[in-house]
Interface confidence: low
């Protein structure tokens, strides 16, 4: 008889999760020479150790420390790109602007991007049926705690001018409850980060409003300024043209700062 399993509100662990993580790790270390020293089996073991046989609503950042240690990576100053609610464009950007990095361009972010996982208390099994939902079940679940942990670390290690891409189509352009608003903003280090530059991405071609004047952006500016970090904001009215010019900066039509 199949043993009883806790039913959570969220979708279960991504199919072939261990194989996916291991394969991504191997691929990443092959492509990034500075990470060639990483032993992917050890990475998987550390990843697995963070959540296997643990109650999936009682995961802590401490659980992920062995993994974080193995995945230690630094981003050059001025090259960190944070994002909130606009992941696809941020990733399209760093795919072209290869010297800038989102969290998902780093090893740990790359391993976990778009995946779901959880285990069960006192068994070595992975739960492929359901996992805790952040709202309906609990916030201290394996996936949420992972992203909180690596996002905190990513922000803590940033230096120089940090950029953040924000979605100008949302009612809250800056959302204090997002990972960016609740974790990354508060973990930028004023002694290392001289400025945060927000890029507000416009959704509509006819939209010429200055979204840098949006009340939520002013709120972000206030939070950042109180932390003794300078704040700048730019409207990106034409994200399609923005990417086009990142691809072809030598095009005479693209002689503009981003």
């Amino acid at each position: 008889l199949p043993r009883w399993r806790q039913q959570w509100s969220g979708s279960g662990t991504t199919s072939r999760f261990p194989e996916t993580v291991l394969a991504r790790c191997v691929k990443y270390t092959e492509v990034h020479p500075e990470m060639r020293h990483v032993d992917c089996q050890s990475v998987w073991d550390a990843f697995k150790g963070a959540f296997i046989s643990k109650y999936p609503c009682n995961i802590t950042e401490e659980d992920y420390q062995p993994l974080v240690k193995l995945g230690t990576q630094t981003v050059p100053c001025n090259k960190t790109l944070l994002w909130s609610r606009i992941k696809d464009l941020a990733h399209q950007f760093t795919q072209v602007q290869r010297d800038m990095f989102t969290l998902e361009d780093m090893l740990l972010g790359y391993l976990a991007d778009d995946l779901t996982w959880c285990g069960e208390f006192n068994t070595f099994e992975i739960n492929y049926q359901s996992c805790p939902d952040w709202r309906k079940d609990c916030s201290n679940n394996p996936v949420s705690v992972f992203w909180k942990t690596v996002s905190r670390r990513f922000a803590e290690t940033a230096c120089g001018v940090v950029h953040v891409m924000l979605n100008g189509s949302r009612s809250k352009i800056f959302d204090k409850n997002s990972t960016f608003g609740s974790v990354e903003v508060h973990n930028l280090q004023p002694e290392k980060v001289q400025a945060l530059e927000a890029w507000v991405i416009h959704g509509g071609r006819e939209d010429s409003r200055d979204l840098c004047q949006d009340p939520t952006i002013k709120e972000l500016e206030s939070i950042i300024s109180k932390r003794n970090i300078r704040f700048f904001c730019k409207n990106i009215y034409r994200p399609d043209k923005f990417l086009q010019c990142v691809k072809n900066p030598e095009d005479s039509s693209c002689l503009s700062g981003i």
């Epitope: 409003r209 840098c212 730019k234 009215y237 034409r238 039509s253 002689l255 700062g257 981003i258």
Partner: antibody, heavy 123, light 111 residues
Framework: EVQLLESGGGLVQPGGSLRLSCAAS????????MSWVRQAPGKGLEWVSD????????HYVDSVKGQFTISRDNSKNTLYLQMNSLRAEDTAVYYC????????????????WGQGTLVTVSS | QSVLTQPPSASGTPGQRVTISCSGS????????VSWYQQLPGTAPKLLIY???QRPSGVPDRFSGSKSGTSASLAISGLRSEDEADYYC???????????FGGGTKLTVLG
């Protein structure tokens, strides 16, 4: 090939008005911010005004605020500068210049220029 | 009085290296990109340098730009007689919400 062709300059008395035009070709006009830059005889360049790709945002140098109006007609690929209450100090060659794709970016500068049209304000 | 400050003149002999400075403040050069333009006598300005140090295609690599803090400079190496022109620096000024130019530097190639 990008081309910008200014017209509408000439001799005008103090207090008079002129409307400059800049006909653009060789690129998608409504993708770009545009500017007017002037140069008084024997002097340096002075940025006058700029307008965003869809006309939604305009800026002016303090000395012409309330006096000049920048506009554009994207259906005609044309940029305009309406100049009222002209003074002797407005005498200059006026250049139309193509700015950046992202109007308020910190890199708003000018990759292409027209040959300029001379405005002379004198009685 | 220009917002950005340039020396009114500079000179050099063919083959020499000449540097033109451009000084501003935190609201323009300090926070924003600098570009440089060359204006030959009787012609419209031409973009030489953008984004502080980038050259548009077609501009010889004898021209280079750099920036430090609130100052920028244009260097011309291997000076040629055809480089004799007026040179202008330009930036965006965040507090003025507009572009600003330097007063221009007249470069004379001697001999």
């Amino acid at each position: 090939e990008v081309q910008l062709l200014e017209s509408g300059g000439g001799l005008v008395q103090p207090g008079g008005s002129l409307r400059l035009s800049c006909a653009a070709s060789g690129f998608t006009f409504d993708d770009y911010g545009m500017s007017w830059v002037r140069q008084a005889p024997g002097k340096g360049l002075e940025w006058v005004s700029d307008i965003s790709w869809n006309g939604g945002k305009t800026h002016y140098v303090d000395s012409v605020k309330g006096q000049f109006t920048i506009s554009r007609d994207n259906s005609k690929n044309t940029l305009y500068l309406q100049m009222n209450s002209l003074r002797a100090e407005d005498t200059a060659v006026y250049y139309c210049a193509r700015g950046s794709l992202f109007h308020d970016s910190s890199g708003f500068y000018f990759g292409h220029w027209g040959q300029g049209t001379l405005v002379t304000v004198s009685s | 009085q220009s917002v950005l400050t340039q020396p009114p003149s500079a000179s050099g002999t063919p083959g020499q290296r000449v540097t033109i400075s451009c000084s501003g403040s935190s609201s323009n050069i300090g926070d924003n990109y600098v570009s440089w333009y060359q204006q030959l006598p009787g012609t419209a300005p031409k973009l030489l340098i953008y984004r502080d140090s980038q050259r548009p295609s077609g501009v010889p690599d004898r021209f280079s730009g750099s920036k430090s803090g609130t100052s920028a400079s244009l260097a011309i190496s291997g000076l040629r007689s055809e480089d004799e022109a007026d040179y202008y620096c330009q930036s965006y000024d965040s507090s003025l919400s507009g572009s600003v130019f330097g007063g221009g530097t007249k470069l004379t190639v001697l001999g």
